[in-house]
């Protein structure tokens, strides 16, 4: 039975040209995290594999940085970056847990962040 839950940064906004940290946290399970995928709708952005470490998709290498932790930093944001992002935790023995974050990239300088939390 899957007992874990994923907390995410929820709905967030950021300014065009700026940076944002996408963060998820898996709790309430003792399952081993074998891999975390970061995906944007139909694209794979990056993977953190327990054995192989971080790998960034070539098309995002210039604008995506690994971390902090299992999170992902998006840089040089454009309005086209607006949309859904998914953290997909592959765990053993539980299976797969998915978290969703909606990012809105704003033209104006009034970019208000959604609920944030500290990752220990």
């Amino acid at each position: 039975m899957m007992t874990g839950t994923i907390e995410t940064t929820g709905n967030i906004s950021a300014e065009k040209g700026g940076s944002i940290i996408l963060q998820c946290h898996l709790s309430s399970t003792t399952a081993q995290v074998t891999q975390v995928n970061w995906e944007q709708q139909d694209q794979l952005l990056a993977i953190c594999n327990a054995d192989l470490g971080w790998h960034i998709s070539p098309s995002f290498k210039d604008r995506v940085a690994p971390g902090p932790g299992l999170g992902l930093t998006l840089q040089s944001l454009t309005v086209n970056d607006t949309g859904e992002y998914f953290c997909i935790y592959h765990t053993y023995p539980d299976g797969t847990y998915t978290g969703r974050i909606f990012l809105e990239v704003l033209e104006s300088s009034v970019a208000e962040h959604g609920a944030r939390f500290q990752i220990p």
Partner: antibody
């Protein structure tokens, strides 16, 4: 349309090698792992190994280690399996199959090629 | 010899339900949720029907369902139809030994 197109049937002599190809289309090739599964006539499915182009990571089932080479060419979106030291019991249909999920976790396969029949006979 | 044991054959009449079992051990099926089921018609490639014990890929009929109890996973097909006649394979995945398939079950629709 997402599909995997495999190379044609082969007839090989015992002791020789065979190389089967699997060309992917309709998706980002590097993002998904490709596994190779074979099926001898009238028998069940047998996982041989797989490759994750995203990492260039290759896993081969213990039974086939030393005899199987799995490669991928990202420029042509093609995966290959080469099986050496062929024997009659290697006669089978060889399938390539794409991982259900991106990143090469390899727990389930949602897209399959039509299979390539390899016959090993003297 | 497969590490996963399936009945060689099962049968049922149209409209009925049938269940195919897949028995492993406490170190494979009993210890994780990475169990999948495939359908294979003669001369065709396998088709994924269930993954992670009970999840259906898009496009698969909701007449197919998966479950697990202890070391045994099960595939249930309800409202049996003629086109369900095929071979069915379970599989178990572990990060160390990757994918192992059951020997397959032939489903006959009477």
């Amino acid at each position: 349309e997402v599909q995997l197109v495999q190379s044609g049937a082969e007839v090989k002599k015992p002791g020789s090698s065979v190389k089967v190809s699997c060309k992917a289309s309709g998706y980002t090739f590097a993002s998904y792992g490709i596994s190779w599964v074979r099926q001898a006539p009238g028998q069940g499915l047998e996982w041989m190994g797989g490759i994750t182009p995203f990492f260039n990571r290759v896993d081969v089932a213990e039974k086939f280690q030393g005899r199987v080479t799995i490669t991928a060419d990202k420029s042509t979106s093609t995966a290959y399996i080469e099986l050496s030291s062929l024997r009659s019991e290697d006669t089978a249909v060889y399938y390539c199959a794409r991982d259900l999920r991106r990143g090469g976790v390899g727990d389930a396969f949602d897209i399959w090629g039509r299979g390539t029949l390899v016959t090993v006979s003297s | 010899q497969s590490a996963l044991t399936q009945p060689r054959s099962v049968s049922g009449s149209p409209g009925q339900s049938v269940t195919i079992s897949c028995t492993g051990t406490s170190s494979d099926v009993g210890s994780h949720n990475y169990v999948s089921w495939y359908q294979q018609h003669p001369g065709k490639a396998p088709k994924l029907m269930i993954y992670e014990v009970s999840y259906r890929p898009s496009g698969v009929s909701n007449r197919f369902s998966g479950s697990k109890s202890g070391n045994t996973a099960s595939l249930t097909i309800s409202g049996l139809q003629a086109e369900d006649e095929a071979d069915y394979y379970c599989s178990s995945y572990t990060p160390s030994s990757a994918t192992v398939f059951g020997a397959g079950t032939k489903l006959t629709v009477l």
